[in-house]
């Protein structure tokens, strides 16, 4: 058993590189990483996706992209990404790191994800060797990162097969380890040079200062020039630690994501990694091998590098990788008003009062299938029903028998009598009209408006609410 | 809760074209991906394919020359013909749902026996 | 496509002991996307595991489900009378969709 641990050191456009992707999001940003180890170097063992393991990242600083300005560096996330193995360590094995970006902006359905690059490489690496380090590029990002395998105890060996368990753990005091395989002893961790970086250097003999891939110096602290030293053939230059460039089409590695350039006449060739394909391997062949889909999706195609594949994501999920959760609400699928709710698995409805249904579809006030008693008419509207109720009657359902003197209609002392179409007004003296709301003039012309044609002042009048009325 | 209701005819001559229907109740067939599955006499589950109300369709390969599915989302139902059939298409015809958080089948019809013969 | 290999083709127990269905498929099944399900004769197949050890909604505790990559294991512990059927895995990572060919339960 043991830990796969990856440090990513940077990530950002290559030398000449103008990546476009950083600058498509519309708001703040942050990178995480995922690492997938897959076992043997061969095209066949490579097939299984992941099957030594897999790690995500945590998510790294906020940062807010800037089209104008020159892209830096972008920031990190802090710490190593660990992959845990629980059987023997395969010493060969291919390493495939993806760079995503998650877009914080307030676009629907919550952050968005997509990947900026993907880089694989395929290694031989020992158990509890030092740090290898490693400059590999993806289009025009380029990604610096360091890797290494150790054994967790009590395993050791090259491969964390071999068990070393002193016979008194206690014996192992602080800054001690346990003993070499199949001795009874513990042993120290030799002492790298003082100041030596402890980022950068390593050291296997006690006082000396070896340096990762990338960095040079007694302490390696200085950063190799990378514009001089990838990928270059030539003789070492003692004074940078840089090779220096010979002639050739295979000049500064054309082949990006690990793939190596060989001549041919007056041109090169790229021979790609699994997973790549282009003139430049720039092109990334990702098959349903590889497991790309997210979130339940279904990898459909794909089965070699040169188809396509396509993820079939579940409702709820969308993106070429089924990486981003659709927002199921903004397509306003509740009716009436209803509040919507996504769970994930399903969605719900939570309705207004009033309303029922999957979608809050049902009017549970509306007519359809609703009496007004005793003669009384339904009426929709504003999302509700009422019912207008025959005279003598009242209520929600018209149920309930209505005295129509009750609120006393009739004005200025009028005398008010129920009737079966309503209710009569019997007026006081000097007031005449259905409520006797109109005062009689003393010369005896009526305050009342002109007498609809047909009718001659003085006839009992009938209005359009028709209630029977009498002046006196 | 959710229903699903296999109908079509019980017997079709070979060389003619199998046409299925599911009704599917209680639950819009909008929200989900929907499939077929047959299951010969005494044998195991093949997967036919599925369909999904925007069109999407995936079929298996082995009969992908030979299925069509379709679905109506005004009858909340969804079909199923399979062309040039033999006898050794003769099966248990399922219609499944696919759950929401992967392509598993969730809900399943009772099934519907189909057999080919003259 | 992916193969899945269910292993043994029948297992014979009694109720009370402890039931172990092996599914191999012959490619890592990328996140764990396997489900596994029960038929009885007759009936259409119930869903009782998904993603490798989640339970689908009804399923009594009794079932569980592990593994990952390769090697996928349904554990029935404790075998009631009900449980003696027809179980097949399937995986649905990788189109096209495939089934196992099943291990039959069956009273000892």
């Known amino acids: 058993a043991g830990v796969f641990e990856l440090q990513i050191h940077s990530f950002g456009p290559g030398p000449g590189g103008a990546p476009r992707s950083p600058y498509s999001a519309r708001g703040p940003c942050r990178l995480f990483f995922r690492v997938c180890l897959k076992p043997g170097l061969s095209e066949e063992a490579a097939e299984s996706p992941c099957a030594l393991g897999a790690a995500l990242s945590a998510r790294g600083p906020v940062y807010t992209e800037q089209p104008e300005a020159p892209a830096p560096d972008l920031p990190l996330p802090n710490g190593l990404l660990q992959v845990p193995f629980r059987d023997a360590w395969p010493g060969t094995f291919s390493l495939i790191i993806e760079t995503w970006r998650e877009e914080l902006g307030d676009q629907i359905g919550g952050p968005a994800w997509s990947l900026l690059a993907r880089v694989t490489r395929r290694r031989r690496l020992a158990a509890g060797g030092p740090w290898a380090g490693d400059i590999q590029r993806a289009g025009a990002w380029e990604l610096r990162f360091s890797y290494r395998a150790r054994c967790e105890l009590p395993a050791v060996g090259t491969a964390c097969t071999r068990l070393c368990r002193p016979r008194s753990a206690s014996r192992c005091g602080p800054g001690l380890r346990p003993c070499a395989p199949l001795e009874d002893e513990c042993e120290a961790p030799p002492v790298c040079r003082a100041g030596c970086s402890l980022e950068h250097g390593f050291c296997e003999q006690p006082g000396e200062c070896r340096c990762l891939e990338g960095w040079t110096g007694p302490l390696c602290m200085v950063p190799v020039s990378t514009s001089s030293c990838l990928g270059l053939r030539g003789p070492s230059s003692t004074t940078t630690g840089c090779l220096v460039p010979g002639p050739g089409p295979c000049d500064g590695n054309p082949c990006a994501n690990g793939g190596s350039c060989s001549e041919t006449p007056g041109s090169f060739e790229c021979t790609c990694p699994r997973g790549f394909y282009g003139l430049r391997c720039e092109v990334s062949g990702v098959t349903c091998a590889d497991g790309p889909c997210f979130n339940g999706g279904l990898c459909v195609g794909g089965a070699d590098p040169d188809s396509a594949y396509i993820c079939h994501c579940p409702p709820g999920f969308q993106g070429s990788n089924c990486e981003k959760r659709v927002d199921r609400c903004s397509l306003q699928p509740c009716r009436n008003g209803g509040l919507c709710l996504d769970l994930g698995h399903a969605l719900r409805c939570r309705c207004r009062a009033g309303f029922a249904g999957p979608r809050c579809e049902h009017d549970l006030n509306d007519c359809a299938g609703r009496a007004c008693a005793n003669g009384g008419t339904c009426v929709e509207g504003g999302g509700a029903h009422r019912c207008s109720c025959a005279l003598g009657f009242g209520g929600r359902d018209c149920r309930e028998r209505a005295d129509p003197c009750a609120a006393r209609p009739c004005a200025h002392g009028g005398r008010c009598y129920a009737h079966f179409s309503g209710l009569v007004c019997a007026c006081a003296p000097g007031y005449m009209g259905a409520r006797c709301e109109f005062p009689v003039h003393p010369d005896g012309v009526s305050a009342l408006p002109a007498a609809p044609p047909g009718l001659r002042p003085g006839d009992p009048q009938r209005y359009p609410h028709h209630h029977h009325h009498h002046h006196h | 809760q959710v229903q699903l209701q296999e109908s079509g005819p019980g017997l079709v001559k070979p060389s003619e074209t199998l046409s299925l229907t599911c009704t599917v109740s209680?639950?819009?067939?909008?929200?989900?991906?929907w499939s077929w599955i047959r299951q010969p006499p005494g044998k195991g589950l093949e997967w036919i394919g599925y369909i999904y109300y925007s069109g999407t369709t995936n079929y298996n390969p082995s009969l992908k020359s030979r299925v069509t599915m379709s679905v109506d989302t005004s009858k909340n139902q969804f079909s199923l013909k399979l062309s040039s059939v033999t006898a050794a298409d003769t099966a248990v015809y399922f219609c499944?749902?696919?759950?929401?958080?992967?392509?598993?089948?969730?809900?399943w019809g009772q099934g519907t026996m189909v057999t080919f013969s003259s | 496509e992916i193969v899945l290999t269910q292993s043994p083709g029948t297992l014979s127990l009694s109720p009370g002991e402890r039931a172990t269905l092996s599914c191999r498929a012959s490619q890592t099944i990328s996140s764990s996307y396997l489900a596994w399900y029960q038929q009885k004769p007759g009936q259409a197949p119930r869903l009782l595991i998904y993603?490798?050890?989640s339970r689908a909604t009804g399923i009594p505790d009794r079932f569980s489900g592990s593994g990952s990559g390769t090697e996928f294991t349904l554990t029935i512990s404790r075998l009631e009378p009900e449980d003696f059927a027809v179980y097949y895995c399937q995986q649905y990572g990788w189109s096209p969709i495939t089934f196992g060919q099943g291990t039959r339960l069956e009273i000892k």
């Open positions: 993603g490798a050890s």
């Open positions: 209680n639950v819009s067939i909008s929200s989900y991906y």
């Open positions: 499944a749902r696919l759950s929401n958080w992967g392509f598993a089948f969730d809900i």
